[in-house]
């Protein structure tokens, strides 16, 4: 079947990285610079994605595969194929329309992206706060007071990192 198909369509013999050149008697020509074909039998090569400005080349274009972009330092990718670059914030902040803002009391963000989220409410699980929350870190829940048998030494919480808060009880 392959032999029959190639007799009928010489273009099917053209491998990835080439195109079937109608201007040259349908011979397989290499893709021109800044273009690629990822499959065989192509009649044209596709233009490569160009990473410019805030977009940075993560993977160079080759004759058989497209370039891939990510974002310059201080930004992170959003959208299909990194179609947007969103500004990073510091841990303990979230991005608003007016730029990076500190998390409100009772919320935290441990990443450079995303929104501030409420501290865990330990009491909902019948537990107590072992380590207080900060803008950058969630509270750490410990065993409930009832779980500590009489005479057992209670856990001393480590010093909070910065601006300690208290989980809403």
């Amino acid at each position: 079947f392959e032999r029959t198909r190639s007799l009928q369509d010489p273009c099917s013999n053209c491998p990835a990285g080439t195109f079937c050149d109608n201007n040259r008697n349908q011979i397989c020509s290499p893709c021109p610079p800044n273009s690629f074909s990822s499959a065989g039998g192509q009649r044209t090569c596709d233009i490569c994605r160009q990473c410019k400005g805030v977009f940075r080349t993560r993977k160079e274009c080759s004759s058989t595969s497209n370039a891939e972009c990510d974002c310059t330092p201080g930004f992170h990718c959003l959208g299909a194929g990194c179609s947007m670059c969103e500004q990073d914030c510091k841990q303990g902040q979230e991005l608003t329309k007016k730029g990076c803002k500190d998390c409100c009391f009772g919320t935290f963000n441990d990443q450079k992206r995303g929104i501030c989220r409420p501290w865990t409410n330990c009491s909902l699980d019948g537990k107590s706060v072992l380590v207080n929350g900060t803008k950058e870190r969630d509270v750490v829940c410990g065993p409930s007071p009832a779980d500590l048998s009489p005479g057992a030494s209670s856990v001393t919480p480590p010093a909070p990192a910065r601006e300690p808060g208290h989980s809403p009880q």
């Epitope: 400005g53 805030v54 959208g79 179609s83 670059c85 329309k97």
Partner: antibody, heavy 123, light 107 residues
Framework: EVQLVESGGGLVQPGGSLRLSCAAS??????????VGWIRQAPGKGLEWIGD???????YYNPSLKSRVTISRDNSKNTLYLQLNSLRAEDTAVYYC???????????????WGQGTLVTVSS | DIQLTQSPSSLSASVGDRVTITCRAS??????LNWYQQKPGKAPKLLIY???TLQSGVPSRFSGSGSGTDFTLTISSLQPEDFATYYC?????????FGQGTKVEIK
């Protein structure tokens, strides 16, 4: 508030040159990731990208104009420039400068535009 | 260069109508496509970026969809201020290119 104000348009002789300015306010041309470009529109026609310049100083040009165009900037004045040489009648257009990217999300879209300046190439 | 072909070139519609404009790219451009509105004598205004993200301050009746080669701008209920020319623009590679425009006129 981001503002872009173009100046320098007017009547130019064929074969001459033009130098347009674009004064930016509300942001810095040297802010990381930010690009500013020039786009033109011939009377009654569509939009044509001329080129752009980024915070790093790297420039990109439309190949159809590359041999005649230079985009530059003066960070101290927060001003962008477009130099176009060997002018011909078909360069008659409104020339816009525009900032790429939105407030905190950047990419090659033009979110802020100047009012445009008309350049007429005629003898 | 990547060519963008808009259709229709012009259309007549009434206030309240749902209007759809399409933009076809000469090859796949993923989601690297933007939409603008331009009124006579004014600079273009960004409506949609990255195929489907609504620019801040743009009414929610505008929406964008599509990826690859076929993209759509939809105005869910046309308002008097929406009569204008609309352009798509790709940023997959340079030169950045625009569609030829679609003029939306009053029926």
């Amino acid at each position: 508030e981001v503002q872009l104000v173009e100046s320098g348009g007017g009547l130019v002789q064929p074969g001459g040159s033009l130098r347009l300015s674009c004064a930016a306010s509300g942001f810095s041309l040297s802010t990381s990731g930010v690009g500013v470009g020039w786009i033109r529109q011939a009377p009654g026609k569509g939009l044509e990208w001329i080129g752009d310049i980024y915070h790093s100083g790297s420039t990109y040009y439309n190949p159809s104009l590359k041999s005649r165009v230079t985009i530059s900037r003066d960070n101290s004045k927060n001003t962008l420039y477009l130099q176009l040489n060997s002018l011909r009648a078909e360069d008659t257009a409104v020339y816009y400068c525009a900032r790429e990217g939105s407030t905190a999300v950047l990419g090659d879209w033009f979110a802020y535009w100047g009012q445009g300046t008309l350049v007429t190439v005629s003898s | 260069d990547i060519q963008l072909t808009q259709s229709p070139s012009s259309l007549s519609a009434s206030v309240g109508d749902r209007v759809t404009i399409t933009c076809r790219a000469s090859q796949s451009i993923s989601s690297y496509l933007n939409w603008y509105q331009q009124k006579p004598g004014k600079a273009p205004k960004l409506l949609i970026y990255a195929a489907s993200t609504l620019q801040s301050g743009v009414p929610s009746r505008f929406s964008g969809s599509g990826s690859g080669t076929d993209f759509t701008l939809t105005i869910s209920s046309l308002q008097p201020e929406d009569f204008a020319t609309y352009y798509c623009q790709q940023y997959y590679s340079t030169p950045l290119t625009f569609g030829q425009g679609t003029k939306v006129e009053i029926k």
